[in-house]
Interface confidence: low
């Protein structure tokens, strides 16, 4: 196809010889075509254009990329000729740096919607060169880490040696989307969340007398977490006594907050103390009821089919533990005054008698 009508952009990749880094080209198709190809997922069903390409082939890239050989040979299909370059929707990812990546890259819609779209293409002239050794020793890494829950910043590697005052205007992208909130050589993050992780691209313009280039760098940002230094705390039950009605079913809930741990093995169990004996109770599985970046709230219930006289003499203990330590909360049952008639009490005593027999045989098995 004729590429003379393609819009042209010049980019410079100055790669560090000390580190492995990636590079990304965006297929910046002129609007409004771009929205049809790259951002389909952002369109609501009522906004879908009539001639939207690839409605049956979601997994195929929406644009086609080519490389233009410098000797004037026909355009090369990147997927076939360059295994170190990955085509991903509207981006081209270079997995390895090197001057051999220098060249002209052309992107166009995989499927044109009308004859007028033949010129809907972008030609990117990419110059790749190693960063000179004279440049700043402490330049920012192409892999940067942010500690979850704290403040942090993401620096543009090609500009990290310049003060904010000297720095040119920078355009930032995250996972291919423009970030309009910052124009400086670093992004300050007031509180780091998981969503801050991703692939960031920073662009700035460098001009000489002859022409103007976009200098681009790619930063892989990962979010990391520090372990809690606290043992879990029990949120419920708060009170150490609980008023109950004899003969009625009862559920006691234990809720505890566990701080984040890199290997999370929370322990939560109920056990019963009766005189000198204590045993763990088989209760329903614990479940997570709230999960945040820094902690998780887990709940586990103990269920009594009917409260008996014996239960009033027992202590019900919720035990929780993480790698730092454990916490317990004891609950004593207390009969509600004026509750239940004679029938309820008689029923409760019958249950108690059956339970005593069951407990004694269970006890005998264990010892």
């Amino acid at each position: 196809f004729n590429i003379s009508g393609c819009s042209t952009k010049k980019l410079l990749w100055a790669y560090s010889t000390r580190s492995e880094e990636e590079f990304i080209l965006f297929c910046d198709l002129p609007e409004p075509q771009k929205s049809h190809f790259c951002h389909r997922s952002q369109l609501s069903p009522t906004q879908v254009p009539d001639h939207l390409p690839f409605t049956d082939s979601k997994d195929l890239p929406d644009v086609q990329w080519y490389r233009q050989p410098s000797n004037g040979d026909p355009l090369e299909d990147i997927r076939k000729s360059y295994p170190h370059i990955i085509q991903d929707k509207c981006t081209l990812r270079f997995l390895t740096p090197g001057v051999n990546n220098t060249g002209s890259y052309i992107c166009r819609p995989k499927m044109i919607k009308s004859p007028y779209d033949v010129a809907c293409c972008v030609k990117m002239i990419l110059e790749v060169k190693p960063q000179s050794n004279a440049s700043c020793e402490n330049s920012a890494s192409h892999k940067q880490d942010l500690l979850l829950g704290s403040t942090g910043s993401i620096s543009c590697p090609s500009l990290s040696c310049q003060s904010d005052a000297q720095s040119p205007e920078v355009t930032w992208y995250k996972n291919g989307k423009l970030l309009s909130m910052t124009r400086s050589n670093r992004i300050v993050v007031d509180e780091v969340y998981i969503y801050h992780q991703g692939t960031y691209v920073c662009d700035y313009t460098q001009s000489d007398t002859a022409s103007s280039w976009t200098v681009r760098a790619v930063v892989q940002v990962r979010t990391i977490v520090g372990d809690t230094k606290l043992k879990p705390d029990i949120l419920d039950p708060v009170e150490s006594t609980l008023e109950v009605e004899l003969g009625k079913p009862l559920t006691i809930s234990c809720k505890a907050r566990f701080g984040f741990e890199r290997v999370f093995n929370p322990v939560m169990k109920w056990y019963i103390k009766d005189a000198d004996l204590e045993w763990e109770v088989s209760v329903p599985e614990a479940k997570s009821i709230k999960s945040t970046l820094k902690d998780e709230i887990i709940e586990r219930n103990i269920i009594l089919e009917k409260v008996t006289q014996r239960d009033l003499r027992r202590t019900f203990v919720c035990f929780v533990q993480n790698s730092i330590g454990n916490t317990t909360q004891s609950v004593q049952l207390k009969e509600k005054r004026g509750s239940g008639g004679l029938n309820d009490i008689f029923e409760a005593q019958k249950i108690e008698w059956h339970e005593t027999v069951r407990f004694q045989s269970h006890h005998h098995h264990h010892h």
Partner: antibody
């Protein structure tokens, strides 16, 4: 670019204490976990333990009684001490950075930056 | 401790071959598995995390798969620089453990 530089003696006498230090350059020791791993000659890798910059440690139970890992944030370094060594402790010892990667629904930790390795021989 | 068993212990292959290494865990570890490459006299190099996610800068001919107890590392088309020893590592529970390694040699 974070780099790890290991230092310490290559020869230790039996029953003595092996001491190695790992210095972090090109980045801060803060906010990361740091591990020690060893590899006996011709064998596989064995994790010794980790330390968080705050001082929290976790050791391999098989070595726990003999291992101490400490951190000095002011010097940007962390250290390994292994007491009462025997010939079975002869190995290449590596220090490494552990990073947490938010992958799918969970956090997984991998050792993404390694020291150059120190060959330690236990012999009289 | 969770044991990781790699197979085969060693294998010979030629440049351009497709190679698969397996790693079996003694109990389920979800997808908390990483793969490393080690060349003689060098420190291990991190390749894959979360069983199948490729570390930045690792060539796309490397791929990982699996979940639970059975995992594989595949090199789709062997290059001369791929001849090395490969280790799997679990981070699901302490102590962290590694497989015994698979030595990949030139045929």
């Amino acid at each position: 670019q974070v780099q790890l530089q290991q230092s310490g003696p290559g020869l230790v006498k039996p029953s003595e204490t092996l001491s190695l230090t790992c210095t972090v350059s090109g980045g801060s020791i803060n906010n990361y976990y740091w591990s020690w791993i060893r590899q006996p000659p011709g064998k596989g890798l064995e994790w010794i333990g980790y330390i968080f910059y705050s001082g929290t440690t976790n050791y391999n139970p098989s070595l726990k009684s003999r291992v101490t890992i400490s951190v000095d944030t002011s010097k940007n370094q962390f250290s390994l001490k292994l007491s009462s060594v025997t010939a079975a402790d002869t190995a290449v010892y590596y220090c490494a950075r552990d990073v947490g990667i938010a992958a799918r629904n969970s956090y997984y930790y991998v050792m993404d930056v390694w020291g150059q390795g120190t060959t330690v021989t236990v012999s009289s | 401790a969770i044991q990781l068993t790699q197979s085969p212990s060693s294998l010979s292959a030629s440049v351009g071959d497709r190679v698969t290494i397996t790693c079996r865990a003694s109990q389920g570890i979800s997808s908390a598995l990483a793969w490393y490459q080690q060349k003689p006299g060098k420190a291990p190099k991190f390749l894959i995390y979360d069983a199948s996610s490729l570390e930045s800068g690792v060539p796309s001919r490397f791929s990982g798969s699996g979940s639970g107890t059975d995992f594989t590392l595949t090199i789709s088309s062997l290059q001369p620089e791929d001849f090395a020893t490969y280790y799997c590592q679990q981070f699901n529970s302490y102590p962290i453990t590694f497989g015994q390694g698979t030595r990949l040699e030139i045929k």
